[in-house]
């Protein structure tokens, strides 16, 4: 059975995260897609989503936060920048497609952001612009700013599972292990 | 004991396909992501493609898209890469290589299947 | 595509020598670059990633250093077993693409 997976990734400040999210590209390559945080009895709030539709690795910067899609491969990468100990939270991903419900994408990452620095090569760099290069960019449209409340419970239901296999069944299993993630500041 | 274990070596004539199979063990085969890379005799190493084991999703290099599939049996933890439309320039050995985590951005290859060897040849 | 450019492609060194192989990007890809080693017949072996970490496992003689788009792998000492081909490769955005080789031969 496909699973719902939750990945822990321990930070300290001023580091950066960098993850993906992968998808069926032949159903949702264009499809608008954003990064959510989930607080505990809330509904997932939208913090940056791609352009729609969606460019291929086009980076999208919003504050901290940049995304780029890469269409052709089936991966949104998520770079969250200098961060901070209130980043810390649970995150996913998931593709807007109106008039449905938005589609959660593998996996969640449950962040852990620590006061302290670390001594890693490149770490004192804490310039989101200097180190990447991208010039701020704003999305053509808004974020949508409805989300599903079904995404709030700990269970999710089977619908958002991965669409070439719609009848498994979905756990949400806690990964114990962390990762810890070398700092590219 | 972690590895990665590919099937037999292969001959098939052009216009075939072939089915690269890739059997894991002694980790949890859904959490790191599964890439193919391939090397033709006396050249580099050449990227073709990832799959996340977990979710079956994959993506391919511009070059194999529309002749590469890649899926895998959660079951049995095998991996599969199947090449279609062969060519002579297809002759190479195909790789499995485990990369990170499968929410990881971090690509880099830390076990390595032994090679499966396809020659393609009239 | 970012373009991994490696060089020497071919050097040849006496065991005891310390060598160093150069990996340079197109275009700045940071720290997103490993290193591997591939033996005839073998397949390749991750020795360093993230350009300076050392993966478990790995000799000390190994090290990498570099960020943006030049990158160095050096053996301090030289040993029997390291004759090999070395390969550098990014990840800093898709297509992840990897260098020529360097071959790196008894003298």
């Known amino acids: 059975a496909t699973k719902l997976t939750e990945e822990k990734y321990e930070l300290k400040e001023g580091q950066t995260l960098d993850v993906k999210c992968d998808y069926t590209l032949e159903k949702f390559a264009s499809s608008q897609k954003a990064w959510q945080i989930i607080r505990d009895g809330e509904m997932p709030k939208t913090l940056a989503c791609t352009e729609r539709p969606s460019k291929n690795s086009h980076p999208v910067q919003v504050g901290r936060i940049i995304l780029e899609d890469y269409h052709d491969h089936g991966l949104l990468r998520v770079r969250m920048v200098n961060l901070q100990v209130e980043d810390s939270g649970l995150y996913q991903c998931v593709i807007y497609q109106p008039p449905k419900e938005p589609h959660m994408l593998f996996d969640r990452i449950r962040l852990v952001v620590t006061k302290g620095f670390s001594g890693t090569p490149g770490s004192n760099e804490n310039s989101t612009q200097n180190v990447y290069k991208i010039p701020p960019t704003t999305t053509k449209a808004l974020c949508p700013l409805y989300t599903s409340p079904r995404t709030v419970t700990q269970a999710p239901p089977k619908s958002t599972a991965d669409v070439s296999t719609p009848d498994s069944e979905i756990n949400l299993t806690n990964v114990t292990d962390i990762i810890r993630v070398p700092v590219f500041n | 004991q972690v590895q990665l274990v590919q099937s037999g070596a292969e001959v098939k004539k052009p216009g075939a396909s072939v089915k690269v199979s890739c059997k894991a063990s002694?980790?949890?085969?859904?959490?790191?992501?599964i890439n193919w890379v391939r090397q033709a005799t006396g050249q580099g190493l050449e990227w073709m493609g990832w799959?996340?084991?977990?979710?079956?999703?994959?993506g391919s290099v511009q070059k194999f898209r529309g002749r590469v599939t890649m899926t895998r049996d959660t079951s049995i933890h095998i991996a599969y890469m199947e090449l279609s439309s062969l060519r002579s320039e297809d002759t190479a050995v195909y790789y499995c290589?485990?990369?990170?985590?499968?929410?990881?951005?971090?690509?880099?290859?830390?076990?390595w299947g032994r090679g499966t060897l396809v020659t393609v040849s009239s | 595509d970012i373009q991994m450019t490696q060089s020497p492609s071919s050097l040849s060194a006496s065991v005891g020598d310390r060598v160093t192989i150069t990996c340079q990007a197109s275009?700045?890809?940071?720290?997103?670059l490993n290193w591997y080693q591939q033996k005839p017949g073998k397949a390749p072996k991750l020795l360093i990633y993230?350009?300076?970490n050392l993966e478990t496992g790995v000799p000390s003689r190994f090290s990498g250093s570099g960020s943006g788009t030049d990158f160095t792998f050096t053996i301090s000492s030289l040993q029997p077993e390291d004759f090999a081909t070395y390969y550098c490769?990014?990840?800093?955005?898709?297509?992840?693409?990897f260098g020529q080789g360097t071959r790196l031969e008894i003298k």
């Open positions: 290589a485990r990369g990170g985590y499968t929410s990881s951005w971090r690509h880099y290859f830390d076990l």
């Open positions: 275009q700045d890809i940071r720290k997103h």
């Open positions: 993230d350009a300076a």
């Open positions: 002694g980790y949890t085969f859904t959490r790191y992501d």
């Open positions: 490769q990014h990840y800093a955005n898709l297509p992840i693409t």
């Open positions: 799959m996340n084991p977990n979710s079956g999703n994959s």
